[in-house]
Amino acid sequence: TLNSVLNSNAIKNLPPPLGGAAGHPGSAVSAAPGILYPGGNKYQTIDNYQPYPCAEDEECGTDEYCASPTRGGDAGVQICLACRKRRKRCMRHAMCCPGNYCKNGICVSSDQNHFRGEIEETITESFGNDHSTLDGYSRRTTLSSKMYHTKGQEGSVCLRSSDCASGLCCARHFWSKICKPVLKEGQVCTKHRRKGSHGLEIFQRCYCGEGLSCRIQKDHHQASNSSRLHTCQRH
């Protein structure tokens, strides 16, 4: 069951799908491993880099996209690859680094003036229209592209935290990702213990806000390891 994996908290500056797990009782649902919570560990350091397997772009970091590592390679084996810089070849927006988008097979700058005309009338401010698309581009690229135009408000669909307005982060919620509030002092957070321990998840909390860190609540020190309550506390 998913009872042990329904709540989690994204670590600051890491891609939204990252997160550990905390129990959320009473949720009667079962799921295959891919649909609601891609999960896995995307916390990679330069000196210990290991390719992260993925199924879709959202599972990768802000500066990555999901694809087969070799041209014409096994389509079943995909990993997170470094995003393409300006003027590099691309097939979709997600391949281009933040601040760029894919046009005519080339990553080009998505600066405000250049990009505004192409998306002006296509997407509502709040993503109220679930299925808006840009000239046949996919939902993922639509949403990420749109964000150079207007930052997502709380509850808006997003791809990454940079898509959201100040004070919000992009976090997974069931089958989607939406802008959620960054955690305030005293709010419950999820502490990620060791690298590699991040459980599958479908409900993420944001990271703790400026000047706060996710620590065990003082009166919970005696509790068992598995039930320790973490909250956002002053450094």
Epitope: H24, G26, G34, I35, E56, H131, H173, F174, S176
Partner: antibody, heavy 117, light 107 residues
Framework: EVQLLQSAAEVKRPGESLRISCKTS????????MHWVRQMPGKELEWMGV????????SYNQKFKGHVTISADKSSSTAYLQWSSLKASDAAMYYC??????????WGQGTLVTVSS | DIQMTQSPSSLSASVGDRVTITCRAS??????LNWYQQKPGKAPKLLIY???RLHSGVPSRFSGSGSGTDFTLTISSLQPEDFATYYC?????????FGQGTKLEIK
């Protein structure tokens, strides 16, 4: 324009199998999750489950798990809900709904399933 | 599962009236509440998502408020086309669950 066109009403006997469909158009089928929702006569809506058409992954409400199967065919941009053995209590209106956010924005017109001996 | 309880179950009102429908969750669901409108023989339509965000194409006379466990759908000035059944839905915890509905009838 997003459109979800569901198959026609069905009249079945208990124990029979059934598959109803939801054909989509106006968007890229694999980019949105597809949900099935049941509404028994005069009752509220019940979420049955969801499928990610891009990879076939499914998730079910525990209440319906094992009794129904959700599937999708990418080539025809169609989602399916099927029963291997219908019960009288399966008589209801069934809706498909496709979405990206945690809400159901686009709905099919519904398929009425009648089960009687 | 989280239980959603709507009140009243039915409501009679006149065109131009201000109408309020409430929805109570059995546990805290933060802002993860949606409202739908359903007319007889038709599929539901999304009105409001994430507690108060108006879905595209929905008239501004509809509004949502509340937080935690108690939520409200308000129609500021009833129009003839607003007579229907309204459902709330929580999407805080799987499985998503709906209220039993509030039938809004013409007085």
């Amino acid at each position: 324009e997003v459109q979800l066109l569901q198959s026609a009403a069905e009249v079945k006997r208990p124990g029979e199998s059934l598959r109803i469909s939801c054909k989509t158009s106006g968007y890229t089928f694999t980019e949105y999750t597809m949900h099935w929702v049941r509404q028994m006569p005069g009752k509220e809506l019940e979420w049955m489950g969801v499928i990610d058409p891009s990879n076939g992954d499914t998730s079910y409400n525990q209440k319906f798990k094992g009794h129904v199967t959700i599937s999708a065919d990418k080539s025809s941009s169609t989602a399916y809900l099927q029963w291997s053995s219908l019960k009288a209590s399966d008589a209801a209106m069934y809706y498909c709904s496709s979405t990206t956010g945690p809400w159901f924005a686009s709905w099919g017109q519904g398929t009425l399933v009648t089960v009687s001996s | 599962d989280i239980q959603m309880t709507q009140s009243p179950s039915s409501l009679s009102a006149s065109v131009g009236d201000r109408v309020t429908i409430t929805c109570r969750a059995s546990q805290d669901i933060s802002n993860y509440l949606n409202w739908y409108q359903q007319k007889p023989g038709k599929a539901p339509k999304l009105l409001i998502y994430y507690k108060s965000r108006l879905h595209s194409g929905v008239p501004s006379r509809f509004s949502g408020s509340g937080s935690g466990t108690d939520f409200t759908l308000t129609i500021s000035s009833l129009q003839p086309e607003d007579f229907a059944t309204y459902y709330c839905q929580q999407v805080h915890t799987l499985p998503p669950t709906f209220g039993q509905g509030t039938k809004l009838e013409i007085k």
